[in-house]
């Protein structure tokens, strides 16, 4: 009976998801694998969050209001695990927009969701930033390893959008 | 003002490369924005070829295969066209345009255009 | 690709008319449009952005409107220098394509 109630309840949760994604894909995880933590097919998973890399070339407001379109915001990076996981998936000769950028120009960093930034976990290119007119962050592959430069918002960039999982 | 000039051959044998110059004025193309190539061809359409960004990178629209290849000389101030085995497909007005004005909403700035003939 | 319709792809008018243009996109583009107009033998000049926004020295007769994949370019009380070529394109992702074109004729 508690197995039967929690099947509809995961039922109608799923139900109510399948609006905004057409498929997801879930696994068990929890102490009693009796969880599921989901992700919109095909994005990937990592740790408590979900992961698309968008390869059409956007703005970064674009590619902002395009993952926001999804439920997402531009990926916010947090570890150094977490941009290695990312960068198995990225193409070595393209840039990536991150969720990161300096709207006045005045090196005054700020992620899109608000995370403080903390210049001890961040992965800039050396002498990188350079530019007060590159006011937002890309990801991209210089000096043999992936990192972080700052570019012109209005120039278009593929971009990595990153959500919650979804818990059903 | 920012000032975009298009020149080259008005004249392409089929199954030769057409190669346009666009020289800009009043902004420096590696200090920012892209810089585009669009085509009018006769019956007024108008084409996307491709670009290059301020950094260097380039973005060809994939319609155009192999065909494309944009290049720029900074100290000069110039961006380059070359489309190679050119057909009367091709015969078109090329335009220099700048990229990226209004949070990349609008082109505000074009060359007057050159056109090109493609015939034996 | 997105693909932009325009129609209609040719109007008649008279000076003082109000004339309405429209553009529809193949998906969402945001309200990321941009209107032109072109003289015979010169190139495209922006008339509108962002869908409603006009560009710097456009008259205030010319307005811009839409949403989602449906937009219009509206030109209250034609005057003789409005006749002309409108073109529509998107600048939702790359590449951004255009419309075919109204061509706006004096009647």
């Known amino acids: 009976n508690f197995m039967y109630s929690k099947t509809v309840k995961r039922l109608s949760k799923l139900q109510e998801y399948q609006q905004y994604y057409p498929s997801l894909t879930c696994v068990m995880e929890g102490k009693d694998m009796e969880d599921w933590s989901c992700c919109p097919t095909p994005w990937t998973s990592f740790q408590s969050s979900c992961y698309f890399i968008s390869t059409v070339m956007q703005s970064w407001t674009k590619s902002q209001n395009n993952c926001s379109v999804m439920g997402a915001d531009l990926v916010v990076i947090n570890t150094k695990e977490e941009q290695d996981f990312i960068t198995q998936n990225l193409k070595i000769n393209s840039a990536y927009f991150l969720g990161l950028s300096d709207p006045k120009g005045w090196r005054h960093w700020q992620w899109v969701d608000q995370t403080p930034y903390n210049k001890n976990v961040t992965f800039w290119h050396s002498g990188e930033p350079n530019s007060p007119d590159e006011r937002c962050a890309i990801i991209n592959f210089r000096s043999e390893e992936w990192g972080w430069n700052d570019v012109h918002c209005h120039v278009p960039q593929k971009s990595i959008c990153k959500m919650k999982k979804i818990y059903i | 003002d920012v000032q975009l000039q298009e020149s080259g051959p008005g004249l392409v044998k089929p199954s030769q490369s057409l190669s346009l110059t666009c020289s800009v004025t009043?902004?420096?193309?590696?200090?920012?924005?892209?810089w585009n190539w669009i085509r009018q061809f006769p019956g007024n359409k108008l084409e996307c070829m491709g670009y290059?960004?301020?950094?260097?990178?380039?973005y060809y629209n994939p319609s155009l295969k192999n065909r494309i290849s944009i290049t720029r000389d900074t100290s000069k101030n110039q961006f380059f066209l070359s489309l190679n085995s050119v057909t009367t497909e091709d015969t078109a007005t090329y335009f220099c345009?700048?990229?990226?004005?209004?949070?990349?909403?609008?082109?505000?700035?074009w060359g007057q255009g050159t056109l090109v003939t493609v015939s034996a | 690709d997105i693909q932009m319709t325009q129609s209609p792809a040719s109007l008649s008018a008279s000076v003082g008319e109000t004339v309405t243009i429209t553009c529809r996109a193949s998906?969402?583009?945001?309200?990321?449009l941009a209107w032109y107009q072109q003289k015979q033998g010169k190139s495209p000049q922006l008339l509108v952005y962002?869908?409603?926004t006009l560009a710097d020295g456009v008259p205030s007769r010319f307005s811009g409107s839409g949403s989602e994949t449906q937009y219009s370019l509206k030109i209250n009380s034609l005057q003789p220098e409005d006749f002309g070529n409108y073109f529509c394109?998107?600048?939702?992702?790359?590449?951004?394509?255009f419309g075919g074109g109204t061509k706006l004729e004096i009647k």
């Open positions: 345009v700048r990229g990226g004005d209004y949070d990349d909403g609008g082109f505000a700035y």
């Open positions: 009043g902004y420096s193309i590696s200090s920012g924005y892209y």
């Open positions: 290059i960004s301020y950094d260097g990178s380039n």
């Open positions: 998906g969402n583009i945001h309200n990321y």
């Open positions: 962002n869908a409603k």
């Open positions: 394109q998107h600048f939702w992702i790359i590449p951004y394509t």
